[in-house]
């Protein structure tokens, strides 16, 4: 049995997959900050997790996905206020009893040191220094991401 949060996540991901392919993103749009091969947008207002997920979707983006601890640290370096929390694209899947990214993959237990409980209706937020489990209904800020298309240099055969 999927929770309402899981259904919302699946529905939005499916609708994103149905949309027509768009040309690759070479530069970050206005207001988005480049972090390596991603563009990040930090919200100013607050929302529960599912509304944050939906807002990113309307901007043709997703809630932030963090590949590893190194990417977490670099993202946290952009958060200069210790008191601010941001939703990312990770929530607890009751059916699989595990933390699940909105792209369908599961959290590698070594990637993030989560403070708080892993239980139903729990979603993950990050601050400047830590990673927290919060009730998904909590209203905090959020981070959207867009992937930049890597620019591949053309290789010409020797003449």
């Amino acid at each position: 049995q999927k929770s309402s949060i899981e259904k919302c996540s699946v529905d939005i991901q499916q609708s994103r997959n149905k949309t027509t392919e768009r040309p690759g993103l070479l530069n970050c749009p206005i207001y988005w900050q480049q972090l390596r091969e991603k563009c990040l947008l930090f919200s100013h207002t607050v929302n529960p997790w599912n509304n944050s997920l939906a807002d990113c979707s309307t901007k043709e983006s997703s809630l932030l996905l963090i590949r590893d601890k190194d990417e977490l640290i670099h993202t946290q370096n952009l958060i200069r206020d210790k008191a601010i929390l941001f939703w990312i694209g990770l929530n607890f899947s009751l059916s699989e009893k595990n933390w699940k990214w909105i792209n369908g993959s599961f959290l590698n237990s070594n990637d993030l040191e989560i403070r708080g409980d892993a239980k139903e209706n729990s979603c993950i937020s990050i601050s400047q220094t830590s990673v927290y489990s919060e009730y998904c209904s909590t209203e905090i800020r959020w981070i959207c991401q867009k992937e930049l298309t890597p620019v591949r240099n053309k290789v010409y055969p020797d003449s």
Epitope: P29, I30, Q33, H44, T45, K59
Partner: antibody
């Protein structure tokens, strides 16, 4: 209620640097984009650039080589420096709050006229 | 950069009449990120409409925005005496954000 107040000299000599500060009250600067816009007398509006509280900036390409915007979160202020000014830089300079792709320039300072003249 | 062209340059109308202001973009405005501002002499601009059709906080419902792509319209359903001012459109979907040259709504 968020309020913005520009301050700085009203007269700058040609080739010198124009320096303005915007003080934000009624809200924290640790969010939003903080923008500068100018309006030459009797003319339209021109966006100069913005800064995010973490130091991320974006400038109008037409002014980029001469513009620096900085932020001081401890004082709830952000500043504009425009170097090598000419008479064409004479304008009313406004600071404003910008919520980016959510809501654009929703709070403005009252503006300050800067005249470039020797 | 995106060039915004507003028309007409001046609109002469009487209180109670309907005002229709046009803003045309040189290329499509991303996600309808288009705003309208009102400016009175000696004052800073005031945000009226954002996202092409959403009214900003505290803006009366006689102001409405519409359009997408390259063509946008600001409509004032019944002009009040305080509505006579200059109106600017702005796109904020592409860098740099740009403004139209303005439409002056004056009393006939």
């Amino acid at each position: 209620q968020v309020q913005l107040q520009e301050s700085g000299p009203g007269l700058v000599k040609p080739s010198e640097t124009l320096s303005l500060t915007c003080t934000v009250s009624g809200g924290s600067i640790s969010s939003y984009f903080w923008s500068w816009i100018r309006q030459p007398p009797g003319k339209g509006l021109e966006w100069i650039g913005y800064i995010y509280y973490n130091g991320h900036t974006n400038y109008n390409p037409s002014l980029k080589s001469r513009v620096t915007i900085s932020v001081d979160t401890s004082k709830n202020q952000f500043s504009l420096k425009l170097s090598s000014v000419t008479a064409a830089d004479t304008a009313v300079y406004y600071c404003a709050r910008d919520s980016g792709p959510w809501v654009p320039l929703d709070y403005w300072g009252q503006g300050t006229l800067v005249t470039v003249s020797s | 950069e995106i060039v915004l062209t507003q028309s007409p340059g001046t609109l002469s109308l009487s209180p109670g009449e309907r005002a229709t202001l046009s803003c045309r973009a040189s290329q499509s405005v991303i996600s309808s990120y288009l705003a309208w501002y009102q400016q009175k002499p000696g004052q800073a601009p005031r945000l009226l409409i954002y996202g092409a059709s959403s009214r900003a906080t505290g803006i009366p419902d006689r102001f409405s925005g519409s359009g997408s792509g390259t063509d946008f319209t600001l409509t004032i359903s019944r002009l009040e005496p305080e509505d006579f001012a200059v109106y600017f459109c702005q796109q904020y979907g592409s860098s740099p954000p740009t403004f139209g040259q303005g439409t002056k709504v004056e009393i006939k």
